[in-house]
């Protein structure tokens, strides 16, 4: 006879029908309390209505309780990231209960079938939480559900079905297919917990987006724009992660959300900051490095609860591996030009010199195009903490080697063969550190020498306090 399981009746693996020789059909969701940091330890299995394992395995009723929820699986085994996450949680929160939700039999199916099983698994987790709430000292506010991919939506269902409100849900690159644009009750949403934070690492506006693009939490963080993750290119995975195929690139980018979260647990001294911004392009332009009015936040475990925000999109750059932290800088550069330089865009690099270290030659990424006789904003980032910025060097490498630019160069030459070499005038650069929120203005050492041409460099030093331009005839007055 069928074993009842939650509101949906018996769970049956649609791909693998249980054999007749099996004496019983087990529910396909179980809860493994990880009692040791040792990944080889089998842990303890908890089940609703059985209090003995809670006592035997020293479940701490007053401590934080983490539920880790895996996603769809092609192999039917726990993936390697899971053990890293368990270990990191144990390292950071020594007294916490870490529970792995094992729904492998229901996840090891066609993706569409696994999606259809998410609701039932969410119910199962909610039942477990409802039962734990009957125990003295257990608080739903101490519960943190961490769901990866399809598991993020399972967490959403669990938060929706539980009696009360769970403290926090973290969605690690929530699954996109069949959830993008879905109704609020059929996917992870801010209503599912007191605080819902989300990391999006594999979103694509073209082709299949493995991760969900839309914001689904109180805060939605898009590292590196939420799409191409450093260290996950085909060239990178060829050399390091298994075999360099598109599948591995997808896995690398999708799983990056987990590693960013693990990083936030184990590298407390190197917290990554994200900055609120309306879209990725504006962030790439360097416009969004403000921390005013809660516009910046830590990412991952250290994210500060922001319940007043909803679907707040936040961005940051990261390194290719742990620790992922980088240091963001906004550069405001006023560029003046005497002559019309056509549509060609200068290829500019900046090197930052600090009290602790010097940066590499950093490209000033032109997101749209440089506006002449206007202030342009750029985003640059460094992997090292440079300390206090002391000086900087701007280099013009000449035109970018695109056919479009080469054609424009040729066209400009034909129309103005006597045109002097192209020249930009940059008198000062205003720098703001995203991490410290400090602003510093850098000036050219000699105000009369502020021009730069292809193949040249221009040095900037901290402007002296109260420094004013004395030469009133200069074309730069009131421009910067």
């Amino acid at each position: 006879s069928p074993v009842p399981f939650g509101p949906e009746g018996r769970l049956e693996d649609k791909l693998h029908k249980p054999k007749a020789t099996q004496t019983e059909v087990k529910p396909s969701v179980r809860f493994n309390l990880r009692t040791s940091k040792d990944p080889e330890h089998e842990g303890c299995y908890l089940s609703v209505g059985h209090s003995q394992p809670l006592e035997d395995c020293s479940f701490n009723m007053t401590a934080k309780t983490f539920f880790i929820i895996h996603g769809w699986t092609m192999s039917g085994i726990f993936e390697n990231w899971l053990h890293k996450l368990v270990s990191a949680l144990h390292t950071r929160e020594k007294d916490a209960n870490v529970v792995v939700v094992d729904w492998l039999p229901l996840a090891h199916q066609l993706y569409t079938d696994a999606v259809n099983n998410t609701r039932v698994v969410g119910h199962s987790i909610a039942r477990m939480l409802d039962w734990l709430q009957e125990k003295d000292d257990f608080s739903l506010g101490n519960v943190h559900l961490i769901g990866y991919s399809l598991g993020a939506h399972v967490a959403g269902y669990a938060g929706n079905f539980v009696k009360g409100t769970v403290g926090r849900i973290t969605g690690l690159d929530p699954a996109g297919p069949m959830f993008e644009g879905a109704d609020i009750h059929k996917r992870l949403s801010p209503d599912d917990a007191d605080f819902v934070d989300v990391l999006h690492t594999y979103t694509r506006s073209f082709g299949l987006s493995i991760g969900i693009q839309m914001p689904v939490g109180h805060i939605d963080i898009y590292p590196n724009g939420g799409d191409f993750q450093p260290g996950c290119g085909l060239n990178d995975v060829l050399g390091s992660i298994a075999y360099g195929t598109i599948t591995e690139v997808v896995k690398c980018e999708h799983e990056r959300a987990v590693h960013l979260f693990v990083d936030s647990l184990v590298n407390q001294d190197k917290p990554s900051f994200a900055f609120q911004c309306t879209d990725s392009n504006r962030f790439k332009k360097g416009i969004c490095l403000s921390c005013r009015k809660n516009r910046c936040n830590n990412i991952g475990y250290n994210a500060k609860k922001m319940r007043k925000k909803r679907n707040s999109k936040m961005y940051l750059k990261t390194r290719a591996g742990m620790p992922f932290k980088v240091y963001h800088y906004q550069l405001k550069v006023h560029m003046f030009s005497y002559n019309n330089s056509g549509d060609t865009q200068p290829t500019l690099y900046i090197t930052l010199y600090g009290s602790n270290a010097d940066s590499q030659n950093l490209p000033l990424e032109i997101v749209e195009k440089i506006e002449l006789n206007a202030t342009n904003t750029f985003l640059v980032y460094t992997e090292e903490d440079l300390g206090d910025l002391l000086k900087m060097r701007l280099t013009w490498e000449g035109v970018a080697h695109s056919w479009y630019n080469l054609w424009n160069e040729f066209r400009n030459y034909l129309s103005q063969p006597s045109n002097p070499s192209r020249e930009l005038y940059i008198r000062r650069i205003r720098v703001k550190s995203g991490e410290t929120q400090r602003k510093v203005t850098f000036c050219t050492q000699d105000p009369t020498k502020s021009s730069i041409s292809p193949g040249q460099e221009l040095w900037f030093h901290k402007c002296q306090d109260g420094w004013k331009m004395k030469n009133k005839t200069s074309p730069f007055v009131n421009l910067a």
Epitope: K26, N32, P39, I77
Partner: antibody, heavy 120, light 111 residues
Framework: QVQLVQSGAEVKKPGASVKVSCKAS????????MNWVRQAPGQGLEWMGW????????TYAGDFKGRFTFTLDTSTSTAYMELSSLRSEDTAVYYC?????????????WGKGTTVTVSS | EIVMTQSPATLSVSPGERATLSCKAS??????????MHWYQQKPGQAPRLLIY???NLASGIPARFSGSGSGTEFTLTISSLQSEDFAVYYC?????????FGGGTKVEIK
């Protein structure tokens, strides 16, 4: 102590079927997956697949799909491997070996092996 | 699937000598700082026995003369001073992804 006890040697004719058992003791049967490994005479080790001892879901390696069936009887902590339509090339020693669901999934406990001989 | 290649196929060593066995994977079997590489010993007529797990960890009850090293795609099993009971076939195995695959084995025989 932890051990896996396998059924005795079998001699079968081509086209027949064989069912090898593997009885576990000394640990909680459903807390570890059960693997099946084949070793043909004078050859190396070949992973055939495994069964999730909690859910009963089997996974078969590429070359072992079709004629091979993994089943369980959790009441007796026993795993079974059944092979139908036997051929001479199925002559081998068949091992069961447990692996954890967590960690690095190595095979830490092995049965002594069951020799299956297919001969006309 | 990941292909494991062991060398040499046969190693002739005198008792008391050091034996070094090599195993190469067709792709990395590392995940972060962990290596999903294991070594087994098999004597004639017996089942394999786990010797080393995760590249360098000694399994329960295994003598300290056995040691494992390596990362990425290249791994080594070392027997510091061969005893008579160590003459056997040694297999390496990866479990970073399914299917778990074994190397072809290295037979350590008496010289």
């Amino acid at each position: 102590q932890v051990q896996l006890v396998q059924s005795g040697a079998e001699v079968k004719k081509p086209g027949a079927s064989v069912k090898v058992s593997c009885k576990a003791s000394g640990y909680t049967f459903t807390n570890y997956g059960m693997n099946w490994v084949r070793q043909a005479p004078g050859q190396g080790l070949e992973w055939m697949g495994w069964i999730n001892t909690y859910s009963g879901v089997p996974t078969y390696a590429g070359d072992f799909k079709g004629r091979f069936t993994f089943t369980l009887d959790t009441s007796t902590s026993t795993a079974y491997m059944e092979l139908s339509s036997l051929r001479s090339e199925d002559t081998a020693v068949y091992y069961c070996a447990r692996r954890g669901y967590y960690g690095r999934r190595y095979f830490d406990v092995w049965g002594k092996g069951t020799t299956v001989t297919v001969s006309s | 699937e990941i292909v494991m290649t062991q060398s040499p196929a046969t190693l002739s060593v005198s008792p008391g000598e050091r034996a070094t066995l090599s195993c190469k994977a067709s792709q990395s079997v590392d995940y972060d700082v962990d290596s999903y590489m294991h070594w087994y010993q098999q004597k004639p007529g017996q089942a394999p026995r786990l010797l080393i797990y995760a590249a360098s960890n000694l399994a329960s009850g295994i003598p300290a003369r056995f040691s494992g090293s390596g990362s990425g795609t290249e791994f080594t099993l070392t027997i510091s001073s061969l005893q008579s009971e160590d003459f056997a076939v040694y297999y390496c195995q990866q479990t970073i992804e399914d299917p778990p695959t074994f190397g072809g084995g290295t037979k350590v025989e008496i010289k």
